[in-house]
Structures are given as C-alpha cells and as structure tokens.
Amino acid sequence: LPAQVAFTPYAPEPGSTCRLREYYDQTAQMCCSKCSPGQHAKVFCTKTSDTVCDSCEDSTYTQLWNWVPECLSCGSRCSSDQVETQACTREQNRICTCRPGWYCALSKQEGCRLCAPLRKCRPGFGVARPGTETSDVVCKPCAPGTFSNTTSSTDICRPHQICNVVAIPGNASMDAVCTSTSPTRSMAPGAVHLPQPVSTRSQHTQPTPEPSTAPSTSFLLPMGPSPPAEGSTGD
C-alpha cells in the first residue's frame, strides 16, 4: 500500500519517515499514532494495534503531540508576589508572572521562578533605568540642579525650581525654596513617574516536531541576602 492510504500501525517504506502526527516505535518497528495535547500514551502500539491514548489527570498536562507514558505535572501554585497568567489545564502548564512592583529575578522556560521587589531609589537619587519584567530599577545620584525627595521605584530626578530670590538653595534631595511668591519652573511641578513594567509574558508557544519524552525538572537556586545597591532602600 502507498504510505498515504496505510493505517497505523504500518511499517514505513525503507528510507521513509512516518507521516503527520505519527512516530516510529523502535520496539514494534512500526509507524504509530501520537497522542494529542492533553493526552498521553496509556498503551504503546504493537505490530497489530495502535497507540491507546488517555486524557491527562487533574494537575497534569501535555502541551505537544506525544507518546509519553505519563503527563507532566503542572507547576506549584503561584506565590503571593506572583499572579497566575495561565491556568493549569490538560494542555498547558500553569504560568506565574511577577505582580506589579516586582521583577523576575530567576526566570524559567515560561513565566517566573522567583520574583523580587523593584528597588526604590531613596531621596537624593532618581531612577536612571526603570525596572522591566526581568530587570531591577537602576538608581543614580541626582545631578547638580536636580533633586528627588521621594523613596520611589519610578520617580526620576527633577530640576530645581528657579527662584527670583532663593531662600534656601536646593540640593540633591530637596527643591529650592524661594522667597518670591512666583517661582518659575523648567518643568511642571509634581513627581515625574516612569511607567511600571508590565508583568505579563507572551503565552504563545511553538510546538516542536519531536517532543521530548523526559519531564522537565524545576529547581530553586539558593538566594542569599544581598546588600542594597547604592542609592536604594533595602525594603
């Protein structure tokens, strides 16, 4: 029979691959059906019978066409500093991402393994580089003529107000104080905020033609305490 009309299981012609959504079973030496996402191989194929697939049990999944004997376990529930952006279903693992005000200090294939709070720049320091999904805030000292009087992960250094008559000169952590009732500003008053990083990640995953039969292992790297960076608060 030509390959196009053969039913699984069948022996492929020498030098030919199996067809779409099939795999070559080394034991049976036959092309057999794969199991669809959300299923696993309950019984492997033989020379005379095709693969028997069964649905994944609760809290387990398979995302790809496969012939694995057991479904993969969904990851543990998201921690308090995370939000669940994709639920555990029979076809996909749970994905946890960092909640606003946090960034991913240790990522995994999808989502985040360990979140950390975004650094807050203390007075006299402003945000040089805002935090992102995967990187912390970078603080810098306010340059002469600018200040920041807040402890914030979003505020940048702002220019001192320009006084007709200065009562108290400004410094890195305090604005100038004017005696005149009509100071002028080179910028609009009020704190300048940088946008918070968005903590959602793309959910799109690419299927691969030959899914691995080995379950993925997850682990936590030991994270010792680290001193706060210059210009940041430890909280």
Partner: antibody, heavy 119, light 107 residues
C-alpha cells in the same frame, strides 16, 4: 536568529538536473524537518516533500517521486534538493522551509532559488 | 489529494477596512489549516496555524476561524503593510496542499 539561506539562481536545459542547497542556522538542525516547496511564475505553491535530518529519511509528494532526491549534511546544517529530468514546467522558485510535522505548517522559509529550464 | 479553494482570488480594500478571505477544503481537515502571507519577490510568511493559533510576532489584527471544510482569515483593520497575497494550506493529510491564493490590493 533562525534562518535558511539558499543557493543562487540556476538556468538549465531540458533533461538536465539541478541541485539546490539550503543552509540552516539559529536552531538545532537535526530536530526539524526541512521541506521543499515550489512556486511556478504567477502560480500558487506546491509541496515537494520533506527530509528529517536526524536520520535522512524522507516523505515525498507522489507527483515528484522518482525524480527528486533530498539529502542533508548535518556537519554543515545544509539540506539539498536535486530534481532530475527537468522540463520547462519545472521553471519555478524553489523554497526550503522548516516544517512542523504535528500541525503540518512551515514556520521558517529560505529566500527562494529561481530555477529556469529553457532550451 | 485534498483540493484547497480560496475566494475571492483578488480583493480591493482600503486601509482600516475589515477584510475576510475564505478557504474551502475538498474534504474534512479538522482544524489543520494554516495561513501564509506573501509579498512580491519574497518567501511566504506563516501567519496562523491550526486554524486560529497566531504565529509568534504576528499582529493580533489577524485571526482565523472555521472547522471541517470551511475556514476564514480575517484582518480586523487593514494596515498598509497587509497588502499582499494570502495562501491557505492544509496540514491534515499528505500531500500537503495549498490554496490558489488571494491577492489583496489597495482600492
């Protein structure tokens, strides 16, 4: 980034053979099928077949069986497609494309190789 | 072989328009329907696979629907870069086959 780079244009006489190459980079070459698809001038797309680089096994469109040979060189991550007994209606742009055997799609394409068959 | 028939073969539209292209298979192909975009002198690009899954990097204005034998590609709000030829392709059965294409032109 993931890319497929093909060899240059060819002009052949009827009855001759042509061999087109496709060099892959940016991914693990042996884990994805390399498909060959052609497009005649002003026409649609026609699937020729695929090769699985890990073992060199192939799957062909019956319309091309006996006239086409697909091979790979895993040391250079290069796939080759040879078409024999060329006819004028084989004039086309030949593309290599990385394929997914579960959903039957082509997610990365080469830039195409123009093959002109003319006496 | 499974025949794939696209309609219309050509279509004129304006930037901002909502556009629909249809693809019909000669037999049931479940959800194994893929869509590609091709610009003159360039290779096709995968837009959608398995009827409605958006390939990475493809704008969300593209969407796919249907099942069995009748499928639709929709562009919710046409952008200048969307004027191209679109092909459907079935991934259900060998040989893999394509539709004849729909050329989307500026009105």
């Amino acid at each position: 980034q993931v890319q497929l780079v093909q060899s240059g244009a060819e002009v052949k006489k009827p009855g001759a053979s042509v061999k087109v190459s496709c060099k892959a980079s940016g991914y693990t070459f042996i884990t994805y099928d390399i498909n060959w698809v052609r497009q005649a001038p002003g026409q649609g797309l026609e699937w020729i077949g695929w090769i699985y680089p890990r073992d060199g096994n192939t799957q062909f469109n019956e319309n091309f069986k006996g006239r086409v040979t697909m091979t790979t060189d895993t040391s250079t991550s290069t796939a080759y497609m040879e078409l024999r007994s060329l006819r004028s209606d084989d004039t086309a742009v030949y593309y290599c494309a990385r394929g997914d055997r579960d959903y039957g799609y082509f997610d990365v394409w080469g830039q195409g190789t123009t093959v002109t068959v003319s006496s | 072989d499974i025949q794939m028939t696209q309609s219309p073969s050509s279509l004129s539209a304006s930037v901002g328009d909502r556009v629909t292209i249809t693809c019909r298979a000669s037999q049931d192909i479940s959800n194994y329907l893929n869509w590609y975009q091709q610009k003159p002198g360039k290779a096709p690009k995968l837009l959608i696979y398995f009827k409605s899954k958006l390939h990475s990097g493809v704008p969300s204005r593209f969407s796919g629907s249907g099942s069995g034998t009748d499928f639709t590609l929709t562009i919710s709000s046409l952008q200048p870069e969307d004027f191209a030829t679109y092909y459907c392709q079935q991934g259900n059965t060998l040989p893999l086959t394509f539709g004849g294409g729909t050329k989307l032109e500026i009105k």
